[in-house]
C-alpha cells in the first residue's frame, strides 16, 4: 500500500507492489532550511545531517510552550518525504538540515540569508556532488531574498521552494518569486488545486509546476517511528527537491536549466482544473504536476522548450512587458497576449548580451503580458532577422536568409493603434515555411537559429468561423518553438505556448461579427534535433 | 550473550503491592531502553512501561501510571517494577524485554507468574 | 492510536502446510512492523523485525513481506515446533508499544 502521492509521481513502468525506482539519489546532497528536525526518526535516521547553523527570531506570546516534538514536526516531516525510508521520494539522498523556523513556524529574510551563506560558504569549503536546496518557505516580496537565491543559483545549486499557502499570486512572495528558483504548488490526490481552510495553493506565473501537497503522509516527531499526514506547498516542494535528487543523481552533470526542462517535460499535463484558480491567473499557471522521468537516461536527445510569461505591463499608453529566458536557455520564439485585443505586438531584442521577449501595450489597453519560449539548444546561434513596414499591400516579409540557419519563431510589432481593423487577412504563400509575413503596417520579426542537426517545420491551424480559441499542435518527437496567429484578424488577443500546443485567443465571438475577419489561423513552429538524437544513441 | 533474567513474581493479596526484578547481563546496559509488559492468562500482550537506564527517564501505559513504577539501578544492571493496589485482574506473567525505541524487542526475560488472590 | 488487527485468530494447519497470518494497521506505519512467536509456557520471541528481515536464529521458512498499513507473516511449510501464537507489534505515541490481537496456529 503506496501512499497516493509517491504513486502519483512514479511513472507506471515503475509501479510494482513497491515504490522503489532506480537509483535513490545517492549522488546528491539536499539542504533543508526548516525548523528542528527530530534526525533519530527511523525514516530519516543516518541520512539526515543536523548541521549547527540555526537563526530563529523568538517565538511570540509569554505563554509558548516549547515542547521538542512540535518544535521538530514541520522539519521531520519534510525531510522524510524527500528522502524517507518508506514515505520518501528519494530514498537514497543524504541530507543536512540548518534551523531558520521557530517552534511556531516563523522565521526572518536575514535568517534565511544566513543560512544561504552558510550553504555557500560549505560548499566553497568541501564541494561535493549535485546540491540541493529546499526552501519550504514563504514571505512577503524581498528583492534581497530572492538576489541571495539567484547568486546561489548561479553557483550551480538547485533551489526548490514552496509557492505560499496564500492562495495569491506566488510572485507576491519570496523566494516563490525568485525566477532562479523551482516554485511549487500543491495539488490533492485528485490533482486539483489544494484548498488550506480559506485560503490555499499560490498559483500564478511564478510558479513552476505543481506536486503532491495534500494528506501527504510523512515521518512524524511523536516517536521515532510515527507517521502523520501533512498539507502545503511545503511538501509539494519536498516532493519536487526528491525527483530533483533523483533525476541529478542519474545526471550528475545537468544544470538547472535543464533539470527545470526535464521536471516540465515530465510532468503530467492538463490535469488540474483551473476553475479553482482566478480568472485572470488561469492563462499564466502552470497546469503541471510532477513526476519522475520513466527512465532515469535518455532523455538527452529531446529538444526542451517551455513557456515563461512577463510580468504585466500595466495599462499606460507606451507600457512595455519584458520575458527573459534563463542564463542557459535560447530565446527561441516571442508573442503577446493581452485580455482587452489591445496591444501593439511584440519583438526579440538584445538587452546584456542576450535576447528578451518585449510586449507593447496599446492606447486604451489595459496591459500586456510579453510570452518567451525558452528552449535547450546546445551550439546554438541565433539572431533576429527584421523587415520594417512594407510599402507594399502584399504585407511585410521576412526570412532566414543565412546558409543553415531555420526558422524558430515568427513576431509582429506595430506603431500605429488599431492595426487590422479593416484590412483583409494576409496569406502566407505556399512553398514558403521558412519566412514570417504580416501586416504591411508591421515590422516583422524572425528568430533564426543554427545549430547541429536542427530542423523545423511550420504547422497551420485555419478555422474559418469565428471560435475564441484555435490550437495547433506538434506531433511526437517534435517541440514546439514558435507560435503566432496568422496576420487579418483583427479580435485577435494574442498567441501563447501551452507545452507542445500553440493557442491563439479571440475576443468573445458574440461579439465578433462572422465576417472575414472573423477566420483565426494559429501557426505552429515545430522543430527537433537530430544531433540531440544522435548524441543519445550514442552514449546508450 | 544477552540475558533478561526476572524474579520477584508470587501470590499476593488483593490491595497488596510487590517488586519485579529484571537482571541484564551479555550487553552494555545502558544502550537499550528496558520495557516491562505482561499477560493475562489466555490473553494477548499489553505494554506497561519502560525505562531508559541511561537517563532514568519513563514512560507509562496511561492505564498503569498510578499503578507502576519503574526504577533501576545502574550498579547491578538491574530493572525494578514496582506494582501497587493489586486486584485479581493484575494476575498474569510479567515480561521484561529489551529494544532500542522504535526498533524491535529482540530479547525477552522468562517471565514470571504474579498471582493476586486472596 | 493504532489498532492492529490480525487474522485469522486462529489457524488450523497440518505439517508441511503453508500458513499465512495477516496484520493489518489502523494507519500507515511504514515497514516498522515486527514479528514474534510464543510458544505454551514461554516468552515471547522475535521473528521478523522491519516487515521482511528475519531475525538471527530464525529459520528461512519464516518470511514477513508488505508496508504500509498490510502485512503478512508466511510460513512456508510448517513444522511441528511452528505451532504456536504469533503477534505483530508497531511502535506509536501513546501508548508507544502496540501488539496485535495474536494469532493462534494450531495444529488440524
Known amino acids: 500500500s503506496i501512499p497516493w502521492n509517491l504513486e502519483r509521481i512514479t511513472p507506471p513502468r515503475y509501479r510494482a507492489d513497491e515504490y522503489q525506482p532506480p537509483d535513490g539519489g545517492s549522488l546528491v546532497e539536499v539542504y533543508l532550511l526548516d525548523t528542528s528536525i527530530q534526525s533519530d526518526h527511523r525514516e530519516i535516521e543516518g541520512r539526515v545531517m543536523v548541521t549547527d547553523f540555526e537563526n530563529v527570531p523568538e517565538e511570540d506570546g509569554t505563554r509558548f510552550h516549547r515542547q521538542a516534538s512540535k518544535c521538530d514536526s514541520h522539519g521531520t516531516h519534510l525531510a522524510g518525504v524527500v528522502s524517507g525510508r518508506d514515505a520518501g521520494v528519494a530514498k537514497g539522498a543524504s541530507m543536512r538540515s540548518l534551523r531558520v523556523l521557530n517552534c511556531q513556524g516563523k522565521g526572518t529574510v536575514s535568517g534565511t540569508l544566513i543560512g544561504l551563506e552558510f550553504i555557500r560558504k560549505s560548499q566553497l569549503v568541501q564541494p561535493v556532488g549535485p546540491l540541493v536546496v529546499l526552501l519550504p518557505l514563504a514571505g512577503g516580496y524581498s528583492r534581497v531574498l530572492n538576489a541571495a537565491c539567484q547568486r546561489l543559483a548561479r553557483a550551480g545549486v538547485v533551489l526548490v521552494t514552496a509557492a505560499g499557502n496564500f492562495r495569491d499570486d506566488a510572485c507576491l512572495y519570496s523566494p516563490a518569486s525568485a525566477p532562479e528558483v523551482i516554485t511549487v504548488g500543491a495539488t490533492n490526490a485528485q490533482d486539483q488545486p489544494v484548498t488550506l481552510g480559506t485560503l490555499g495553493t499560490n498559483f500564478g506565473r511564478c510558479v513552476d509546476l505543481f506536486a503532491p501537497g495534500e494528506d501527504i503522509i510523512g515521518a512524524s516527531s511523536d516517536c521515532s517511528t510515527c507517521f502523520v499526514s501533512q498539507s502545503g506547498t511545503s511538501q509539494a516542494a519536498a516532493h519536487v527537491a526528491g525527483i530533483a535528487a533523483m533525476m541529478l543523481s542519474a545526471e550528475p552533470e545537468l544544470t538547472l536549466a535543464e533539470l527545470r526542462q526535464r521536471l516540465i517535460h515530465f510532468s503530467a499535463k492538463d490535469v488540474i482544473n483551473e476553475a479553482w484558480f482566478p480568472e485572470d491567473q488561469r492563462v499564466l499557471t502552470p497546469n503541471l504536476v510532477a513526476a519522475l522521468p520513466p527512465s532515469t537516461h535518455g532523455a538527452g536527445w529531446q529538444l526542451f522548450c517551455r513557456t515563461v510569461w512577463s510580468a504585466h505591463s500595466g495599462p499606460t499608453r507606451m507600457a512595455t512587458a519584458v520575458a527573459r529566458c534563463a542564463p542557459d536557455e535560447e530565446l527561441l520564439s516571442c508573442s503577446s497576449f493581452s485580455r482587452s485585443g489591445k496591444r501593439r505586438g511584440e519583438r526579440m531584442e538584445a538587452q546584456g548580451g542576450k535576447l528578451v521577449c518585449r510586449a507593447h501595450n496599446a492606447f486604451g489597453g489595459e496591459g500586456v503580458y510579453a510570452i518567451a519560449r525558452c528552449c535547450l539548444l546546445p551550439q546554438a546561434n541565433c539572431s533576429v532577422h527584421t523587415a520594417p513596414p512594407a510599402e507594399a499591400s502584399m504585407g511585410t516579409r521576412v526570412h532566414c536568409h543565412q546558409q543553415g540557419h531555420v526558422l524558430t519563431g515568427c513576431s509582429s510589432h506595430w506603431e500605429v493603434e488599431d492595426l487590422g481593423t479593416h484590412k483583409p487577412p494576409v496569406l502566407r504563400p505556399r512553398g514558403q515555411p521558412n519566412q514570417c509575413v504580416g501586416h504591411r503596417e508591421a515590422s516583422i520579426h524572425a528568430s533564426c537559429c543554427h545549430a547541429p542537426g536542427l530542423e523545423c517545420k511550420v504547422k497551420e491551424h485555419g478555422i474559418p468561423a469565428p471560435q475564441e480559441q484555435v490550437t495547433v499542435a506538434c506531433e511526437e518527437g517534435w517541440t514546439l518553438t514558435g507560435c503566432s496567429a496568422l496576420p487579418g484578424t483583427s479580435h485577435v488577443l494574442g498567441a501563447y505556448a501551452v507545452d507542445n500546443t500553440c493557442v491563439v485567443r479571440s475576443r468573445d465571438v458574440s461579439t465578433t461579427g462572422s465576417t472575414s475577419e472573423g477566420a483565426v489561423t494559429a501557426v505552429a513552429i515545430c522543430c527537433r534535433s537530430r544531433h540531440l538524437a544522435q548524441a543519445s544513441q550514442e552514449l546508450q | 550473550q544477552v540475558q533478561l533474567l526476572e524474579s520477584g513474581g508470587g501470590l499476593v493479596q488483593p490491595g497488596g503491592s510487590l517488586r519485579l526484578s529484571c537482571k541484564a547481563s551479555g550487553y552494555t546496559f545502558s544502550s537499550y531502553s528496558i520495557y516491562w509488559v505482561r499477560q493475562a492468562p489466555g490473553k494477548g500482550l499489553e505494554w506497561i512501561g519502560w525505562?531508559?537506564?541511561?537517563?532514568?527517564?519513563?514512560r507509562y501505559n496511561q492505564k498503569f501510571q498510578s499503578k507502576a513504577t519503574i526504577s533501576r539501578d545502574n550498579s547491578k544492571n538491574t530493572l525494578y517494577l514496582q506494582m501497587n493496589s493489586l486486584r485479581a485482574e493484575d494476575t498474569a506473567v510479567y515480561y521484561c524485554?529489551?529494544?532500542?525505541?522504535?526498533?524491535?524487542?529482540?530479547?525477552w526475560g522468562q517471565g514470571t507468574l504474579v498471582t493476586v488472590s486472596s | 492510536e493504532i489498532v492492529l488487527t490480525q487474522s485469522p485468530a486462529t489457524l488450523s494447519l497440518s505439517p508441511g502446510e503453508r500458513a499465512t497470518i495477516t496484520c493489518r494497521a489502523s494507519q500507515y506505519v511504514g515497514s516498522y512492523l515486527n514479528w514474534y512467536q510464543q510458544k505454551p509456557g514461554q516468552a515471547p520471541r522475535l521473528l521478523i523485525y522491519?516487515?521482511?528481515n528475519r531475525a538471527t536464529g530464525i529459520p528461512a521458512r519464516f518470511s514477513g513481506s508488505g508496508s504500509g498499513t498490510d502485512f503478512t507473516l508466511t510460513i512456508s511449510s510448517l513444522e511441528p515446533e511452528d505451532f504456536a501464537v504469533y503477534y505483530c507489534q508497531v511502535w506509536d505515541s501513546s501508548p508507544p508499544v502496540v501488539f496485535g490481537g495474536g494469532t493462534k496456529v494450531e495444529i488440524k
Open positions: 524485554a529489551r529494544a532500542r525505541v522504535g526498533y524491535s524487542l529482540d530479547y
Open positions: 522491519d516487515a521482511s
Open positions: 525505562i531508559d537506564p541511561g537517563n532514568g527517564g519513563t
